[in-house]
């Protein structure tokens, strides 16, 4: 057992058929010795009387909140929590699999520009009775610092019958260099708490395998006389880290007709402006990804050929 | 510790093309590497991130771009003297600071040099024949350090008596590839911004 | 007061289907688990299994599973436990009884329902 | 799964008497064990459980020991409405268990 925050515990429990429960030991935060009784959650029933309590904590129904009283007067609140283990497995039952990039990813993260600052996010299908803490550091035997804000749900998707819930949290390391070559990577913790069930959750990370810029900005087509080419002309996004001669990115131009299947033609260039050809009904699209350090490329940003 | 924004000569500038040359090869040698050792601990994830170059060279601090000398994160720099004369450095208006950048570059090149070849004599040795060092790698090492051609002592190459431990070498490589890499994208970056200043 | 109030007797053929009920008044239903023993005539106490009244978790019996179903309906505050198939050697009294959380024994205990299979 | 042999099978005592009944577990249970006692034609009741607290509403004649795998029951003064069958069951580990139960009787 162990304590998450003031007055609220976690009970790890090995969940198999077999295993037997955990006890535990609930002591009145009281100087008072006599006339306590305890209670848990909203029943007024008596479990036990003393300035202790031991219980043996082997299902959810075990778990909650225990208050001690004297008469009639709340002297002090325990909560606890369960994390199962089972198989030698810890729980991941309140978050989704993402999948991405890889089998049980729970967490992704992505940053705009080398400044330490990202934001992650997950996913889940509970809809109440649900909190989220997160925590994180630069490396995890001498931790550097990051702050994090609070978890906040920034998205809802109807997925076949199931709603889909993505919660995100922005964070930022307290003394990032842009440019300083990352040998400690990045933890992030997640405290996951669904009614009594407590799960946590971890991702660790490089900022720069992680970085996706925002899409080029004002992506303008100018005709070129007597030709059906136009150039195409762009900027770095404002989010971009800078000085951009030192942050370079590279881009990526695309002709798409109307129809998904017609052939797209690509070209690749390290300008912010390229020629090519403008089909009728076809659009435009470019995309950017850091010049030297092959992570996701951004969004497409697109304008239509007429 | 910081590059002021210089105004070399157009074109003056011939180690762009050797520094994207560097970083080309050593990414191509990294994912030829995860590939070949793809059941030894060889990812980014696996491994541990070591920098020889640390407290040797400090090249980061060295090469920073002026725009970033005002972010204090990035000014913990080490004081490490460095012989400045190159022929990187087209134009006499280059100053002091760009010197000991460049400088730092060659010094790092130098050891992963000679890690590299030492490295290799002991891959040729393995009677599983393996991995091998990527000689077009070796080869644009050298070519970038005679561009930057600075005068410095040699490193003579490490020998070893004792014979080697293949499995542990290989994962040294996937160390050293990893570590490489990232020094290569600095040493772009730099020479990016050297080249537009 | 604490009550658990179990359907009258039943007397069935084998083969056929049941389904027995124990109400509970008198606390916070979804707070307790509730279980459910076994009594053959003239011997002990066997415990089937328990089942949460929040959730439908469900802890049976290795030997009882398969054999019964455990359920509950919150908005009644009811449980139940039914056969599909009775036997002969279903022939018992059956007690539900409540989970004292914490803890893990029965604290209170239904009147019994004796459920007799005979052809 | 856990096995609680109760001893003996039958206990004969006269009113006012101390009675003590034993139960053994085939592995340790630690104090997760809990007495009922049962009356011909009533459900059981809750006499003490985690080896030795008294359930609420329960006379304090009736006390329990133990812990591991040795367990007791003690009636310090049997009453006449104290002769029943009296079952301990184990609750440390899936499936709870009982003892096949002691009968105690009016010599």
């Known amino acids: 057992i162990w304590e998450l925050k003031k007055d609220v515990y976690v009970v790890e429990l090995d969940w198999y058929p077999d295993a037997p429960g955990e006890m535990v030991v609930l002591t009145c935060d009281t100087p008072e010795e006599d006339g306590i009784t305890w209670t848990l959650d909203q029943s007024s029933e008596v479990l036990g009387s003393g300035k202790t309590l031991t219980i043996q904590v082997k299902e959810f129904g075990d778990a909650g909140q225990y208050t001690c009283h004297k008469g009639g007067e709340v002297l002090s609140h325990s909560l606890l929590l369960l994390h199962k283990k089972e198989d030698g497995i810890w729980s991941t039952d309140i978050l989704k699999d993402q999948k991405e990039p890889k089998n049980k990813t729970f967490l992704r993260c992505e940053a705009k520009n080398y400044s330490g600052r990202f934001t992650c996010w997950w996913l889940t299908t509970i809809s109440t009775d649900l909190t989220f803490s997160v925590k994180s550091s630069r490396g995890s035997s001498d931790p550097q610092g990051v702050t994090c804000g609070a978890a906040t749900l920034s998205a809802e998707r109807v997925r076949g019958d199931n709603k889909e819930y993505e919660y995100s949290v922005e964070c930022q390391e307290d003394s990032a260099c842009p440019a300083a070559e990352e040998s400690l990577p990045i933890e992030v913790m997640v405290d996951a708490v669904h009614k009594l069930k407590y799960e946590n959750y971890t991702s660790s990370f490089f900022i720069r395998d992680i970085i996706k810029p925002d899409p080029p900005k004002n992506l303008q087509l100018k005709p070129l006389k007597n030709s059906r080419q136009v150039e195409v002309s762009w900027e770095y996004p404002d989010t971009w880290s800078t000085p951009h001669s030192y942050f370079s990115l590279t881009f990526c131009v695309q002709v798409q007709g109307k129809s998904k299947r017609e052939k797209k033609d690509r070209v690749f260039t390290d300008k912010t402006s390229a020629t090519v050809i403008c089909r009728k009904n076809a659009s435009i699209s470019v995309r950017a990804q850091d010049r030297y350090y092959s992570s996701s490329w951004s969004e497409w940003a697109s304008v239509p050929c007429s | 510790r910081n590059l002021p924004v210089a105004t070399p000569d157009p074109g003056m500038f011939p180690c762009l093309h050797h520094s994207q040359n560097l970083l080309r090869a050593v990414s191509n040698m990294l994912q030829k590497a995860r590939q070949t050792l793809e059941f030894y601990p060889c990812t980014s994830e696996e491994i541990d991130h070591e920098d020889i170059t640390k407290d040797k060279t400090s090249t980061v601090e060295a090469c920073l771009p002026l725009e970033l000398t005002k972010n204090e994160s990035c000014l913990n720099s080490r004081e490490t003297s460095f012989i400045t004369n190159g022929s990187c450095l087209a134009s006499r208006k280059t100053s002091f600071m760009m010197a000991l950048c460049l400088s730092s570059i060659y010094e790092d090149l130098k050891m992963y040099q000679v890690e590299f070849k030492t490295m290799n004599a002991k891959l040729l040795m393995d009677p599983k024949r393996q991995i091998f060092l990527d000689q077009n790698m070796l080869a644009v090492i050298d070519e970038l350090m005679q561009a930057l051609n600075f005068n410095s002592e040699t490193v003579p190459q490490k020998s070893s008596l004792e014979e080697p431990d293949f499995y542990k070498t290989k994962i040294k490589l996937c160390i050293l590839l990893h570590a490489f890499r990232i020094r290569a994208v600095t040493i772009d970056r730099v020479m990016s911004y050297l080249n537009a200043s | 007061e604490v009550q658990l109030v179990q359907s009258g007797a039943e007397v069935k053929k084998p083969g056929e289907s049941l389904k027995i009920s124990c109400q509970s008044s008198g606390y916070t239903f979804t707070s307790y688990w509730i279980g459910w023993v076994r009594q053959m005539p003239g011997q002990g106490l066997e415990w089937i299994g328990i089942?949460?009244?929040?959730?439908?978790?469900?802890r049976y019996n290795p030997m009882f599973r398969g054999q019964v179903t455990m359920s509950v309906d919150k908005s009644s505050s009811t449980a139940y436990l039914q056969w599909s198939s009775l036997k002969a050697s279903d022939t018992a009294m059956y007690y539900c009884?409540?989970?004292?959380?914490?803890?893990?024994?029965?604290?209170?205990w239904g009147q019994g329902t004796m459920v007799t299979v005979s052809s | 799964e856990i096995v609680l042999t109760q001893s003996p099978a039958t206990l004969s005592a006269s009113p006012g008497e101390r009675a003590t009944i034993s139960c053994r577990a085939s592995?340790?249970?630690?104090?997760?064990v809990a007495w009922y006692q049962q009356k011909p034609g009533q459900a059981p009741r809750s006499l003490i459980y985690?080896?030795?607290n008294l359930q609420s509403g329960i006379p304090a004649r009736f006390s329990g020991s133990g812990s591991g795998t040795d367990f007791t029951l003690t009636i310090s003064s049997l009453e006449p409405e104290d002769f029943a069958v009296y079952y301990c069951?184990?609750?440390?580990?899936?499936?709870?268990?009982f003892g096949q139960g002691t009968r105690l009787e009016i010599k």
């Open positions: 985690a080896a030795s």
């Open positions: 089942m949460s009244p929040v959730d439908s978790d469900i």
């Open positions: 592995q340790s249970v630690g104090t997760w």
């Open positions: 009884a409540r989970r004292r959380p914490g803890q893990g024994y029965f604290d209170f």
């Open positions: 069951q184990q609750y440390n580990i899936y499936p709870y268990t």
